[in-house]
């Protein structure tokens, strides 16, 4: 029943060109190249893409033509290796070109940079953007794909095509509007925020596949799809999981043409079989391809079937538990996960995976015992503390969020995480803690039944950002341990970290706390980041500072910024009042 078993094609590049069409083919090749060579100028990538496209067309015309039988990795890798400045721009990545496939592609993958040294994208004036859009729509949209792809080397390529389609629609509509800015800017903000979220979610999928293997990803997919499609049979869910795993393995492996093609096939299969999958798919399946795939990926959970039997009957009370487990361990555990997940849309996927792991560990131990049934009879009792831990954590943190509001809640998390892992770079701590803090506005508004899946699965995505950024430059054994030991226990691992008593406080540097008049012209968000950066640095200097001490200093700092931004001579104010603030803060913190 696998959707993707196709006959072998003489020319893979011709096959994908025909399946995807020229427009999508070119866009996906551009994304692939930009995700590999993140520093290359736009024009160089466009040139490479055009060359590949012309070559693909010759293969469509004659599949037996020279080189048309080569694999896509060979063709694309050969093309990337023609870049003249490879050694100067990328250093040791150039050594990849000395390797043969598949090692060459693996080498390129290993050099993808989650935090490339690229300038922040600055949004031009609306009129400038509209002019550029009208002057050359194709180049304008290609540039969007290029800029996103190079900054997000694991962005889910077929989904980026969907974002580009929305980006184009926003400009098409708003550049004709009476108030272009009022129309366009909210749309661009929404695309930016959704894009960052989409990138982070996909990064977790790739990390799951690459660091923990296919089995880990499949377990995640079984749990999530069982929650989403609780009426579907286990065999149907298993089939969707197999196909989805193939799609994401391809995208995470840089096989973007295959990935996009297979994702389209999967969407087609789901829509053709929606009666046996979910009652919620009807609207999605009426949409065009890109919207359809996106809609299916985001579709709400179907209603649970009535009269679902007790789980204990088959998985605890049955005398056949060990026999069933021994006969096909992963299938039996998959059925357990499916049955548990479809009954618990109120649980996070990571919690469901922890329960499945506990169940597996119990069976491993008990099925070798003298009386297996007696041994595993109380396994469901072991689930109680595992369920209560995230429930309590979410309750406490939502109460704190409601009390403080987002900004101050982020600050509380900044302090908490800086004390846990003070070795991590300040920009990373600020970025991660800010994102962790967004869980409040994102999830605390939900009723109890939706809070945990919202919060804990979101936290998994954010903590993965910390893990991938830390992996590039590891500085903390504690971060490494929490990131690598267990994918599903990352959040509990970080939650359990106490203040790092081994940390030697950072030397005080007045320059870190010197501010200038430019802070006054920053957006509210940028100003918050400046203040939060200062807060992290304060904690790094004085990890034992109390909440009260830090609050006093931060309040003084906010008052100082407000005062100087109102002053006639802002720069003088910042210089003079800044010195006083630093001195007062040192005194308050005993530095």
């Amino acid at each position: 029943r696998g959707v993707f078993r196709r006959d072998a094609h003489k020319s893979e590049v011709a096959h994908r060109f025909k399946d995807l069409g020229e427009e999508n083919f070119k866009a996906l090749v551009l994304i692939a190249f930009a995700q590999y060579l993140q520093q290359c100028p736009f024009e160089d990538h466009v040139k490479l893409v055009n060359e590949v496209t012309e070559f693909a067309k010759t293969c469509v015309a004659d599949e037996s033509a020279e080189n048309c039988d080569k694999s896509l990795h060979t063709l694309f890798g050969d093309k990337l290796c023609t870049v003249a400045t490879l050694r100067e721009t990328y250093g040791e990545m150039a050594d990849c070109c000395a390797k043969q496939e598949p090692e060459r592609n693996e080498c390129f993958l290993q050099h993808k940079d989650d935090n490339p040294n690229l300038p922040r994208l600055v949004r031009p004036e609306v009129d400038v953007m509209c002019t550029a859009f009208h002057d050359n729509e194709e180049t304008f949209l290609k540039k969007y794909l290029y800029e996103i792809a190079r900054r997000h080397p694991y962005f889910y390529a077929p989904e980026l095509l969907f974002f580009a389609k929305r980006y184009k629609a926003a400009f098409t509509e708003c550049c004709q509007a009476a108030d272009k800015a009022a129309c366009l800017l909210p749309k661009l903000d929404e695309l930016r925020d959704e894009g960052k979220a989409s990138s982070a979610k996909q990064r977790l999928k790739c990390a799951s596949l690459q660091k923990f293997g296919e089995r880990a990803f499949k377990a995640w997919a079984v749990a999530r799809l069982s929650q989403r499609f609780p009426k579907a049979e286990f065999a149907e869910v298993s089939k969707l999981v197999t196909d989805l795993t193939k799609v994401h393995t391809e995208c995470c492996h840089g096989d973007l043409l295959e990935c996009a093609d297979d994702r389209a096939d999967l969407a087609k299969y789901i829509c053709e079989n929606q009666d046996s999958i979910s009652s919620k798919l009807k609207e999605c399946c009426e949409k065009p391809l890109l919207e359809k795939s996106h809609c299916i990926a985001e579709v709400e959970n179907d209603e649970m079937p009535a009269d679902l039997p007790s789980l204990a009957a088959d998985f605890v009370e049955s005398k056949d538990v060990c026999k069933n487990y021994a006969e096909a361990k992963d299938v039996f555990l998959g059925m357990f996960l499916y049955e548990y997940a479809r009954r618990h849309p109120d649980y996070s996927v990571v919690l469901l995976l922890r329960l499945a792991k506990t169940y597996e560990t119990t069976l491993e131990k008990c099925c070798a015992a003298a009386d297996p049934h007696e041994c595993y009879a109380k396994v469901f009792d072991e689930f109680k503390p595992l369920v209560e831990e995230p429930q309590n954590l979410i309750k406490q943190n939502c109460e704190l969020f409601e009390q403080l509001g987002e900004y101050k809640f982020q600050n509380a998390l900044l302090v908490r995480y800086t004390k846990k892992v003070p070795q991590v770079s300040t920009p990373t701590l600020v970025e991660v803690s800010r994102n962790l803090g967004k869980v409040g506005s994102k999830c605390c508004k939900h009723p109890e039944a939706k809070r945990m899946p919202c919060a804990e699965d979101y936290l998994s995505v954010v903590l993965n950002q910390l893990c991938v950024l830390h992996e590039k430059t590891p500085v903390s054994d504690r971060v490494t341990k929490c990131c690598t030991e267990s994918l599903v226990n990352r959040r509990p691992c970080f939650s359990a970290l106490e203040v790092d008593e081994t940390y030697v406080p950072k030397e005080f540097n007045a320059e870190t706390f010197t501010f200038h008049a430019d802070i006054c012209t920053l957006s509210e968000k940028e100003r918050q980041i400046k203040k939060q950066t200062a807060l992290v640095e304060l904690v790094k200097h004085k990890p034992k500072a109390t909440k009260e001490q830090l609050k006093a200093v931060m309040d003084d700092f906010a008052a100082f910024v407000e005062k100087c931004c109102k002053a006639d001579d802002k720069e003088t104010c910042f210089a003079e009042e800044g010195k006083k603030l630093v001195a007062a803060s040192q005194a308050a913190l005993g530095l």
Partner: antibody, heavy 121, light 110 residues
């Protein structure tokens, strides 16, 4: 009224197939394992197999491969698919409700009236 | 797995005490997963005893079961006219695939 009603029996040629149904009324099938038992004319009871509440199936060694038990909880019905039928499969086929949910205890406390299957050319 | 019932047939009178035995070729699950059934012509079987000695709902107290492991007994303390029928034992074993019925004991009027 709590009852089980089998249907789908009849005359079938050797090598043929038949699907028997067992419809439950007055209770939900999803709370118990459901078994199939047969009885050749003038002979004793013979266990065929059982399907647990979660859909796990267990078959007598002789039935494995030829007979398949399935259930549709939404229709409150259990099925017995029989393939490659032989003359010796001629019997009254009963469906029965086990005391257990996840396995066969051998204690079937509710039985249907049975449906006769005759395999003959 | 074999379930052997004895005797295969038995004649008795109303008021008699009757004992039927059932032996399995290996121990039943938990040493007590043994049931007894009564079947009358043209009817489905009726559960009398489960877990070796527990009386099924609505079954008269003259029926009782005993035994453990591989050897089990069904006793009817005082035969009534409606008790003349065929009796079967059924054993549950460590796998649900191995559930098995005995060959039956036909109880007739002497």
């Amino acid at each position: 009224e709590v009852q089980l009603v089998e249907s789908g029996g009849g005359l079938v040629q050797p090598g043929g197939s038949l699907r028997l149904s067992c419809a439950a009324s007055g209770f939900s099938l999803s709370s118990n394992a459901m078994g199939w038992v047969r009885q050749a004319p003038g002979k004793g009871l013979e266990y065929i197999g059982i399907i647990s509440v979660g859909g796990f199936t267990y078959y007598a060694s002789w039935a494995k491969g030829r007979f398949t038990i399935s259930r549709d909880n939404s229709k409150n019905t259990v099925y017995l698919q029989m393939n490659s039928l032989r003359a010796e499969d001629t019997a009254t086929y009963f469906c029965a409700r086990d005391r257990h949910g996840g396995d066969s205890s051998g204690a079937f406390y509710l039985w249907g009236q049975g449906t006769l299957v005759t395999v003959s050319s | 797995i074999q379930m052997t019932q004895s005797p295969s047939s038995l004649s008795a009178s109303v008021g008699d005490r009757v004992t039927i035995t059932c032996q399995s070729s290996e121990s039943v699950y938990s040493n007590n997963q043994l049931s007894w059934y009564q079947q009358k012509p043209g009817q489905p079987p009726k559960l009398l005893i489960y877990d070796a000695s527990d009386l099924a709902s609505g079954v008269p107290s003259r029926f009782s079961g005993s035994g453990s492991g591989t050897d089990f007994t069904l006793t009817i303390s005082s035969l009534q006219p409606e008790d003349f029928a065929t009796y079967y034992c059924a054993g549950g074993f460590s796998s649900s695939s191995d559930t098995a019925f005995g060959g039956g004991t036909k109880l007739t009027v002497l």
